[in-house]
């Protein structure tokens, strides 16, 4: 594991990374839940969508999210890999024309209606973590991850590799 400077050096590359294709390399419809098996749900309220983290009743249907995966090239000077280095980026859409967005000023995760090409705020670097969980790092704010705070999704700053394993930024993807 490496310390604060290591995380920052790695994630600094996200600012300059470029999506290598306008089409996703694959798409996947899945339910999203927390490390502790709470479901991420989406509700239409007053013509806007709210995002909740909650325990579902038995046999209650889980909301699905369309995950679209894109390849993103590391800038060669950052990764030390020349043109070799790639990252896997993802956008998350729970319903047509709406995508999860990182609001870095408010440290919040919001659903925004928008057209393609999507803004950078809709892209997250996918990290495979332990226990077959994943984490989502903001493209626009390296070192900041989607996490759970007070039964809502929020943006959480991670400043050391040890904190990358904290449960509140770990999510599970499931087809069921």
């Amino acid at each position: 594991a490496f310390g604060i400077s290591g995380v920052q050096k790695y994630t600094r590359a996200l600012h300059d990374s470029s999506i290598t294709g306008i089409s996703p390399i694959t798409e996947y419809l899945a339910s999203l839940s927390t490390y502790n098996d709470q479901s991420i749900t989406f509700a239409l309220e007053d013509e806007s969508y709210e995002i909740y983290v909650e325990d579902l009743k038995k046999d209650e249907k889980k909301d699905k999210v369309l995950l679209s995966y894109y390849e993103s090239q590391h800038p060669s000077n950052e990764s030390g890999d020349g043109v070799d280095g790639k990252m896997l980026m993802v956008t998350l859409s729970p319903t047509k024309d709406f995508w999860l967005h990182a609001n870095n000023k408010e440290h919040s995760v919001e659903l925004h209606k928008c057209e393609k090409p999507l803004p950078d705020q809709a892209f997250f670097v996918l990290h495979n973590m332990h226990s077959n969980c994943v984490s989502f790092e903001c493209k626009t704010d390296p070192g900041v991850f989607i996490g759970v705070k007070d039964n809502h999704l929020a943006l959480i700053k991670v400043d050391s590799s040890e904190n990358l394993c904290t449960e509140n930024i770990l999510f599970k993807l499931s087809e069921t």
């Epitope: 790695y10 990764s79 990252m87 495979n128 990358l164």
Partner: antibody, heavy 122, light 107 residues
Framework: EVQLVESGGGLVQPGGSLRLSCAAS????????MTWVRQVPGKGLEGVSA????????YYTDSVKGRFTISRDNSKNTLFLQMNSLRAEDTAVYFC???????????????WGQGTLVTVSS | DIQMTQSPSSVSVSVGDRVTITCRAS??????LAWYQQKPGKAPKLLIY???SLQSGVPSRFSGSGSGTDFTLTISSLQPEDFATYYC?????????FGGGTKVEIK
């Protein structure tokens, strides 16, 4: 150019230990998922262990849990596999490999070393 | 653990033939599948990743398809250098498991 060079293989008695090394060049080791894969001569491939780039989290296949330890030295850009309590069934060529994607194993393994042979026999 | 079943285990073909190798996962793995080529005494070489993405430098006669549980590697017109063993690997979840391999031999 990305290069992975394994070393440390050899003949060891059952119950003995070996430490395999994988020297990486052309990229930053700590930015990528790395894995050890083994192959019994003439047989198929088996994933043994892996380590996450950014978090350092480790993974093991059931047959080596508690006996093998994967680690890395970031300053030397080198990956290790410490193998203890070795058994005859651990005899294989051991490869280290690097993922396509820096933060994810979803893309599989793009770069491989040449392999190092471990023989466990009395 | 996810089991990967590859078929056939071996196939005898001629140069110029079309070759199809299939791989079946014991549970859904979305598109998280890779295909490798291995020649005797050498390390595996990545051909296809994310089920259908062609690795840079790999000839276009290689292609991959499928999602969920059923996947296919196709070599459209076999060349002399393609005689080798081919492996699929699920990259969906740990432990990342390989198929048993398909040996492509000269008829």
């Amino acid at each position: 150019e990305v290069q992975l060079v394994e070393s440390g293989g050899g003949l060891v008695q059952p119950g003995g230990s070996l430490r395999l090394s994988c020297a990486a060049s052309g990229f930053t080791l700590r930015s990528y998922f790395m894995t050890w894969v083994r192959q019994v001569p003439g047989k198929g491939l088996e994933g043994v262990s892996a380590i996450s780039g950014i978090s350092g989290g480790t993974y093991y296949t059931d047959s080596v849990k508690g006996r093998f330890t994967i680690s890395r030295d970031n300053s030397k850009n080198t990956l290790f596999l410490q193998m203890n309590s070795l058994r005859a069934e651990d005899t294989a060529v051991y490869f280290c490999a690097r993922t396509v994607y820096s933060s994810s194993y979803y893309g599989g393994f793009q770069h491989w070393g040449q392999g190092t042979l471990v023989t466990v026999s009395s | 653990d996810i089991q990967m079943t590859q078929s056939p285990s071996s196939v005898s073909v001629s140069v110029g033939d079309r070759v199809t190798i299939t791989c079946r996962a014991s549970q859904g793995i979305s598109s998280w599948l890779a295909w490798y080529q291995q020649k005797p005494g050498k390390a595996p070489k990545l051909l296809i990743y994310v089920a259908s993405s062609l690795q840079s430098g790999v000839p276009s006669r290689f292609s991959g398809s499928g999602s969920g549980t059923d996947f296919t590697l196709t070599i459209s017109s076999l060349q002399p250098e393609d005689f080798a063993t081919y492996y699929c690997q699920q990259t969906n979840s740990f432990p990342l498991t390989f198929g048993g391999g398909t040996k492509v031999e000269i008829k």
